[in-house]
């Protein structure tokens, strides 16, 4: 059953050029794995305390622990990670906060600002003294689980001196690593001792192992990388936005819908109105009118801008975003004031979510 | 687990029309847009167009625009791609496809 | 329309050797999906969002790109490999496909 009429024929091309939306950023929560990791929902006077991740509700199991307004993770994965949301139930709305769990070791064997100062690790030896290959800087080499997102850039370093210099080579899972093993190759820079793979795909994951040698002898380190692969979900919504809103005749007024979504989303802005003089059409569902969508002659599409409003303006407005795989909407109100009255955004009246499901 | 089951073998006339159900099951069928890609002999893939059972929000090829409707039963947790005005072009594999999950196929032949 | 081209049309090569798909859109995507489909199935979602595997797809395949090249990489082949392999786009309406790459043994 539609849930709408259309007032009029909104063709929604030509359609949106491609954007990664990923427009609000939300706390980052980062754990190393294995590592127990507790985050406290951020919501004052939670009756009932509901849990998601990537959308999907989150319940306890023998690792996920949920008490009170606390969410405990035991023994960490990089499965873990994802767009963790808490909503608080209260008697007359409800409010969802945000925030991203990364579990995930650094993305580089020390940090990448060391290429810079880098050339230290690259020691020079009196000549007459020949000596075995030796790690000069261990810290860097510490962590040997690496879990990193599908995209991201990996360095692997292994920092060593010697005389003569010893050469550095890279093994996968045991085996010479060739440049032809992976789309992109990989760069080797012998100066800092480090192994850099761009754009890491799951074919990357694996054991990589630096060999160090010269004619004295020969050492070797092994790191294991993770790559972690995201899953497609719905877009998710921002809690609370768009916000109600009120302004005088004659002002402005702008409504913000803040989208999550890995998947090329398609965002309308959507208001009911009348038409011949009735809200609702003779099927009996309201009369609904696309104000604006993403697409190529659209400007930002998550912030709808109202200028010179009248009254007419005043009502429910729908921000409504669908990728291929769901949707999502939410509404806000605009009150329409008198001249004389002053206008203030109504912060603490947000309307509660409304999904199209 | 997902399923997604869909209608039997049709045979048809030029200038009739065609109508494959989809049944769907182990998932919550308002929550995902079903989508309906047809496949000629030999031939690779066409998306036609899918439809929000949520609140039935319909998106089409501009190709197919006009003869093709899709419709879903809430109740029956079934999608419904009804293609008019067959030609024998039209004589393909119809599969209904949750992102994720496909139907097995539904064979129309047109055919006078 | 985004048109996808997927090169070459057929591939021959024996178990064990390293094969590599391509597929160029017409005009920037964000990212691209694919799918394998073998006689008589229907067809199978193989990588989402360019890079990552589907439930129960082999580590041997890889997917890269960005833009309008976009690349499906098997490591080494197995014999249950061998079958056709389609991209697709959801940027933008119609969503289209390529025209399929067959992968056949040599």
């Known amino acids: 059953r539609p849930s709408f009429s259309l007032v009029e024929d909104t063709t929604l091309e030509p359609e949106e050029p491609p954007t990664k939306y990923q427009i609000s950023q939300p706390e980052v929560y980062v754990a190393a794995p294995g590592e127990s990791l507790e985050v406290r929902c951020l919501l004052k006077d939670a009756a009932v305390i509901s849990w998601t991740k990537d959308g999907v509700h989150l319940g306890p199991n023998n690792r996920t622990v949920l008490i009170g307004e606390y969410l405990q993770i035991k023994g960490a994965t990089p499965r873990d990670s994802g767009l963790y949301a808490c909503t608080a139930s209260r008697t007359v709305d409800s409010e969802t906060w945000y925030f991203m769990v990364n579990v995930t070791d650094a993305i580089s064997s020390g940090d990448d600002e060391d290429d810079t100062d880098g050339a230290e690790d690259f020691v020079s030896e009196n000549s007459n003294n020949k000596r075995a290959p030796y790690w000069t800087n261990t810290e860097k080499m510490e962590k040997r689980l690496h879990a990193v997102p599908a995209a991201n850039t990996v360095k692997f370093r292994c920092p060593a001196g010697g005389n003569p210099m010893p050469t550095m080579r890279w093994l996968k899972n045991g085996k010479e690593f060739k440049q032809e093993h992976r789309i992109g190759g990989y760069k080797v820079r012998n100066q800092h001792w480090s192994l850099i793979m761009e754009s890491v795909v799951p074919s990357d994951k694996g054991n990589y192992t630096c060999v160090v040698e010269n004619e004295y002898g020969s050492i070797n380190h092994t790191y294991h990388l993770d790559v972690v692969e995201r899953s497609p979900h719905r877009p998710i919504l921002q809690a609370g936005l768009p916000a109600n809103a009120s302004t005088v005749v004659g002002g402005d007024v702008e409504f913000v819908c803040k989208v999550y979504s890995d998947a090329q989303p398609h965002i309308q802005w959507i208001k009911h109105v009348e038409k011949n003089g009735s809200k609702y059409g003779p099927d009996g569902l309201p009369y609904l009118k696309v104000l604006k969508h993403s697409g190529i002659n659209s400007s930002n599409a998550e912030v709808l801008a109202l200028f010179n409003v009248t009254e007419a303006d005043a009502g429910e407005y729908i921000c409504k975003v669908s990728n291929y795989i769901g949707q999502a909407n939410q509404s806000a109100w605009l009150t329409v004031l008198p001249k004389q009255q002053a206008p203030g955004r109504e912060k603490e009246i947000t309307a509660s979510p409304d999904y199209l499901e | 687990q997902v399923q997604l089951v869909q209608s039997g073998a049709e045979v048809k006339k030029p200038g009739s029309s065609v109508k494959v159900s989809c049944k769907a099951s182990g998932y919550t069928f308002t929550s995902y847009w079903m989508h309906w890609v047809r496949q000629a002999p030999g031939q690779g893939l066409e998306w036609m167009g899918a439809i929000y059972p949520g609140n039935s929000d319909t998106d089409y090829s501009q190709k197919f625009k006009g003869r093709v409707t899709i419709t879903a039963d809430e109740s029956t947790s079934t999608a419904y791609m009804e293609l008019s005005s067959l030609r024998s072009e039209d004589t393909a594999v119809y599969y209904c496809?949750?992102?994720?999950?496909w139907g097995q196929g539904t064979l129309v032949t047109v055919s006078s | 329309e985004i048109v996808l081209t997927q090169s070459p049309a057929t591939l021959s090569l024996s178990p064990g050797e390293r094969a590599t798909l391509s597929c160029r859109a017409s005009s920037s995507v964000n990212y691209m999906y694919w799918y394998q489909q073998k006689p008589g199935q229907a067809p199978r979602p193989w990588i989402y969002l360019t890079s990552n595997r589907a439930t129960g797809v082999p580590a041997r395949f890889s997917g890269s790109g960005s833009g309008t090249d976009y690349t499906l990489t098997i490591s080494s082949l197995e014999p249950e490999d061998f079958a056709v392999y389609y991209c697709q786009q959801w940027s933008s309406n119609p969503y289209t496909f390529g025209q399929g790459t067959k992968l056949e043994i040599k």
């Open positions: 496809s949750k992102f994720d999950y």
